[in-house]
């Protein structure tokens, strides 16, 4: 007899989710010597415990604490790059600028990047059919709560100058409802963080506007200043050239504005 199953509005758990998490954990711990001590089977146990058998609209940050504890990692606090709606370029940047880190360059971020997961109340099954959508169903779903938890911790760890990459092609360059706008901005610690430097990435080749004057950027500046953190902003007019110059800073064309 087929059991009635809750239909959610979002896509179901990524296929082979446990295997993917385990495989990513093994790969990460092999590449990063400082995380070699991590037992990936225990990491998966903590991950499964956070959401399986629990109602997927009733997940709390507390559910993820065992996983957070196992994934505790020290990254240089002055080398943190946050991003909003421009993940690919942020990741391309840290792949070149190896001493800077996005959340997805940490173990926990790497494990969950681009994955979806949820369980069902009172069964030890993973729901591969559907998972709650943040807008249409509920915000306290396993994926959203995970990213809120790790993003908060990542922002809390930051110090000195924190950089954030923002997408200048979007109508809201700074979006208060993004993870950056709703979580990370509010968890930067003023006693540790001196400056938030925004890099606004231009989309069009002929776009020479100063997007640092955009009203949403001014709104970000206001929020940050009220938190006693300095704010600075730079336009990145040519992201392709920007990446190229990160790779080869001595290139003669890299002295001009990018």
């Amino acid at each position: 007899v087929p059991r009635w199953r809750q239909q959610w509005s979002g896509p179901g758990t990524t296929k082979r989710f446990p295997e993917t998490v385990l495989a990513r954990c093994v790969k990460y711990t092999e590449i990063h010597p400082e995380m070699r001590h991590v037992d990936c089977q225990s990491v998966w146990d903590a991950f499964k415990g956070a959401f399986i058998s629990k109602h997927p609209c009733n997940i709390t940050e507390e559910d993820y604490q065992p996983l957070m504890k196992l994934g505790t990692q020290t990254v240089p606090c002055n080398k943190i790059l946050l991003w909003s709606r421009i993940k690919d370029l942020a990741h391309q940047f840290t792949q070149v600028q190896r001493d800077m880190f996005t959340l997805e360059d940490t173990l926990l971020g790497y494990l969950a990047d681009d994955l979806t997961w949820c369980g069902e109340f009172n069964t030890s099954k993973i729901n591969y059919q559907s998972c709650p959508d943040w807008r249409k169903d509920c915000s306290n779903n396993p994926v959203s709560v995970f990213w809120k938890t790790v993003s908060r911790r990542f922002a809390e760890a930051a110090c000195d100058v924190v950089h954030v990459m923002l997408n200048g092609s979007r109508s809201k360059i700074f979006d208060k409802n993004s993870t950056f706008g709703s979580v990370e901005v509010h968890n930067l610690q003023p006693e540790k963080v001196q400056t938030l430097e925004a890099w606004v990435i231009h989309g069009g080749r002929e776009d020479s506007r100063d997007l640092c004057q955009d009203p949403t950027i001014k709104e970000l500046e206001s929020i940050i200043s009220k938190r006693n953190i300095q704010f600075s902003c730079k336009n990145i007019y040519r992201p392709d050239k920007f990446l190229q110059c990160v790779k080869n800073p001595e290139d003669s064309s890299c002295t001009s504005e990018i």
Partner: antibody, heavy 120, light 107 residues
């Protein structure tokens, strides 16, 4: 029909090593994990460690770390448990047991057990 | 490590009796609990997983309940083939740990 067939009984001297095998048939070997559980005469069950063949990773109980090596050979669908520096207290029946990689369920299939006797 | 404590360690019962075995975890394990039956000279056999789910092929007289730290295995009407030793086991975290066992004997 899933079957886990273990190697035969062993008699070993203190200080030596023993390697027990567990050959799986009737299922996709790489879709599962294999644990080793031992039972001393008249005693309860004691988990030793677990291997995930598809990833080639294993973990073990702290009590056995440094003495136990758990491996798997995907080509022959066989899991292995090697215990070194044997002492008389290691005399036990050693079982292999299967569970799913995600560890969402119990040990659903067990080998028949291998008696290892450690005696001088 | 999570300690699993079973009680009683042994009990005597008659065919047809209702038998209850309890298992307590030293810390919360949600519903990550399995029950096994073991007969002399045989490998253990899975009865219950996820605290209350019946393993395929196991008679419905076996049932499990509980979550967190306190769990129960119930045999509603003991049959001759049920005389054996029963173990609980947590699979919430490593190392996996078993209870010390409950031997069910014929009265």
């Amino acid at each position: 029909q899933v079957q886990l067939v273990q190697s035969g009984a062993e008699v070993k001297k203190p200080g030596s090593s023993v390697k027990v095998s567990c050959k799986a048939s009737g299922g996709t070997f790489s879709s599962y994990a294999f644990s080793w559980v031992r039972q001393a005469p008249g005693q309860g069950l004691e988990w030793m460690g677990r291997v995930i063949p598809f990833l080639g990773i294993a973990n073990s109980a702290q009590k056995f770390q440094g003495r136990v090596t758990i491996t798997a050979d995907k080509s022959t669908s066989t899991a292995y448990m090697e215990l070194s520096s044997l002492r008389s207290e290691d005399t036990a029946v050693y079982y292999c047991a299967r569970d799913d990689i995600a560890a969402l369920g119990p040990f659903d299939y067990w080998g028949q057990g291998t008696l290892v006797t450690v005696s001088s | 490590d999570i300690q699993m404590t079973q009680s009683p360690s042994s009990l005597s019962a008659s065919v047809g009796d209702r038998v209850t075995i309890t298992c307590r975890a030293s810390q919360g394990i949600s519903s990550w609990l399995a029950w096994y039956q073991q007969k002399p000279e045989k490998a253990p056999k899975s009865l219950i997983y996820a605290a209350s789910s019946l393993q395929s092929g196991v008679p419905s007289r076996f049932s499990g309940s509980g979550s967190g730290t306190d769990f129960t295995l119930t045999i509603s009407s003991l049959q001759p083939e049920d005389f054996a030793t029963y173990y609980c086991q947590q699979y919430n975290s490593y190392p996996r740990t078993f209870g010390q066992g409950t031997k069910v004997e014929i009265k």
